[in-house]
Interface confidence: medium
């Protein structure tokens, strides 16, 4: 009925967060028994999203208050029998509208989870739930889809023309003719003999009776064909039986007369001449999590939800555990980021699926003419002259090891290095002393630094 800041919780905030107009959506999720939040995230009994969503416009400086919610029902179709005990999860989502909203367009404002016990066919139960600073007022009920009846919607009841031991308005149940449909809680004052109800708080008349409480016999009324009440002396205190008398519209539909006949305006989710057909169409917004609804323009054509990546189920209500497909190889851990999968690889492996073994020469080549060497369960690159690093991708500084002896100057060259020797020395690394008498040069003792061997840079 309303959603907003709870009482006495400091400065009240608006659900729109002072960022312009917004819409609130409510996602209702039903789980069996006690909700096992950690292990079971599926809405196994069913899920639905609110569809009647007004836009709330907030003006700066305006004090925040609870937003009134539209009367549109959130209808959650459930499969199989109604369990009676269930976990109810209601998520309140805010969609921020407008170009300058800033931040994410969708935010989960509140999530209330609670265990409930509820028999089908009972009256509306009211509830108030607080979570964080928010407060949600709502009502809920469970009802069976005809022909199912009973507190668990487990029995099928079909109208039978044969007489039964059931009371007026209570249909026998097939295949249990000795059992009768449990009566609903009808509108107060509804005639127990001549009225009945399929919904709480309604009063539908048996043939031959009319009036809001089914207390007026149609056959004895002298105003049978009168379209307006006659004078009091005639005893016609109520209008005669027009097309809408007795409320021919089921499931809360509203009746209007149209040229001697009637027309039912059905609530969302119900269809047919008398709103007797229940079904969901794309107009109901049955696809969650951004699913695209196709078909289902009318109740006779089924809708299909085309789910976005990461979701499945007839209504895209189930998050796919894509990691359950074990996409990561070599013991990598899988992360489902929603928009993508990512693998956290063990050390020694790489690639989107950890498919590359970094300790395997077959897995990756060494750059710049380097050679891969395997050994001891690991691999390394033996790099060509002038290159270094794990994959030989780094250009080496051949002069870094000070290879020129006896004060020779080192110059890097595309093919390696060149030493410019100090006076009195010669050789590739200035390792030979020149004898003044013209005799052969001899290796000179190192001066200060050890003579560097000509080596490849590893």
């Amino acid at each position: 009925h309303s959603f907003g800041p709870g009482p006495g919780l400091g400065t009240p905030r608006s659900p729109c967060n002072a960022r312009g107009p917004c819409r609130l959506f409510f996602r209702v999720c039903l789980k069996p028994g006690v909700s096992q939040e950690a292990t079971e995230s599926l809405c196994a009994l069913g899920a639905a999203l609110s569809t009647s969503v007004p836009v709330y416009t907030e003006h700066p400086g305006e004090s925040a208050a609870a937003l009134p919610l539209p009367d549109g029902l959130v209808r959650v179709p459930f499969r199989d029998a109604w369990p009676g005990t269930f976990s109810l999860v209601i998520e309140t989502w805010r969609e921020q509208l407008g170009e300058h909203a800033g931040g994410p367009a969708w935010n989960l404002l509140a999530r209330v989870v609670g265990r409930r016990r509820l028999a089908a066919g009972g009256p509306w139960a009211r509830d108030v739930q607080r979570t964080g600073t928010w407060e949600l007022h709502f009502s809920y009920r469970a009802r069976c889809e005809p022909p199912a009846v009973g507190a668990a919607c487990a029995r099928l009841c079909r109208s039978r023309s044969a007489p039964s031991r059931c009371g007026p308005g209570l249909r026998p149940c097939t295949p249990f003719p000795d059992e009768c449909e449990a009566p609903s809680v009808c509108r107060p004052g509804c005639s127990p003999e001549h009225g009945y109800c399929e919904e709480p708080d309604e009063c539908r008349c048996l043939e031959g009776w009319t009036g809001p409480l089914c207390t007026v016999p149609v056959s004895t009324s002298s105003c049978l064909n009168s379209r307006v009440p006659g004078p009091a002396s005639t005893g016609c205190l109520l209008p005669g039986p027009g097309p809408c008398d007795g409320n021919p519209c089921a499931n809360g539909g509203s009746c209007s007369e149209t040229s001697g006949s009637f027309e039912c305006a059905c609530p969302r989710g119900f269809y047919g001449l008398r709103c007797e057909v229940s079904g969901v169409t794309c107009a109901d917004g049955p696809c969650f999590n951004g699913g695209l609804c196709v078909g289902g323009e009318d109740p006779d054509s089924a809708y299909v939800c085309h789910c976005p990546p990461g979701f499945q189920g007839s209504n895209c209500e189930k998050r796919v555990d894509r990691c359950s497909l074990q996409p990561c190889q070599n013991g990598g851990l899988c992360l489902d980021l929603g928009h993508a999968l990512r693998c956290r690889c063990r050390a020694g492996f790489a690639g989107p699926r950890c498919e590359h073994d970094l300790d395997d020469c077959a897995g990756r080549a060494c750059a710049n003419g380097g050679t891969c060497v395997e050994g001891g369960g690991s691999r390394r690159c033996s790099c060509a002259l002038g290159f270094g690093g794990r994959d030989c991708r780094e250009r080496a500084d051949p002069c870094a090891s000070r290879p020129c002896a006896h004060g020779g100057r080192c110059y890097a060259h595309f093919s390696g290095l060149v030493c410019a020797c100090a006076p009195g020395y010669m050789g590739v690394r200035c390792e030979f002393a020149v004898r003044p008498d013209g005799a052969d040069a001899v290796p000179a003792a190192p001066r200060g630094l050890r003579q560097a061997d000509p080596q490849r840079f590893l």
Partner: antibody
Amino acid sequence: EVQLVQSGAEVKKPGASVKVSCKASGYTFTSYWMHWVRQAPGQRLEWMGVIDPSDSLANYNQEFKGRVTLTVDTSASTAYMELSSLRSEDTAVYYCARDSTVVAPMDYWGQGTTVTVSS
Amino acid sequence: DIVMTQSPDSLAVSLGERATINCRATKSISKYLAWYQQKPGQTNKLLIFSGSTLQSGVPDRFSGSGSGTDFTLTISSLQAEDVAVYYCQQHHEYPYTFGGGTKVEIK
């Protein structure tokens, strides 16, 4: 010395849950992943799942259909394995095993915890 | 899931003789196979990983070979302390799966 010390034997009724602990010592707990493996009487070893204690990211064996939950308490250097909706065939020895995360898989194992499920 | 099949189920070998255990995978696991030793009252011990790499501290009489789908664990000279059950395990992809085990005894 690397050690994994597991909690004591448990006897549970069908439908109940069991939580087995594995206390690690002798290494940096958050630097190594932790596997859980079980072995039913006379059966082969069965991998249940693995968790990264640094952020609790876990991968599970889908055979267990959401019945297994792996958690860690990094302050106590302890890993936990909880198995719910127990049935008689869950009677087994449950092991925790450290993952070196380099190339070797499970390089150190706990001594095992016997879980008996019986009505 | 990858199914690992070990053979034989049990093996009796004389002291000092060679013991050979085979392990086959239902699909290629490259070289990613580990071998474990299980003894009563002791923690399980990793012997070999990546098909042939000996785990630190394991005697070199243990060796592993093979790749793809067929692998072998060899104990070149069986010692009394090698009496145990040996398991192979693929560590190529999750869920990790184990072989059925081979019981090694002394003849």
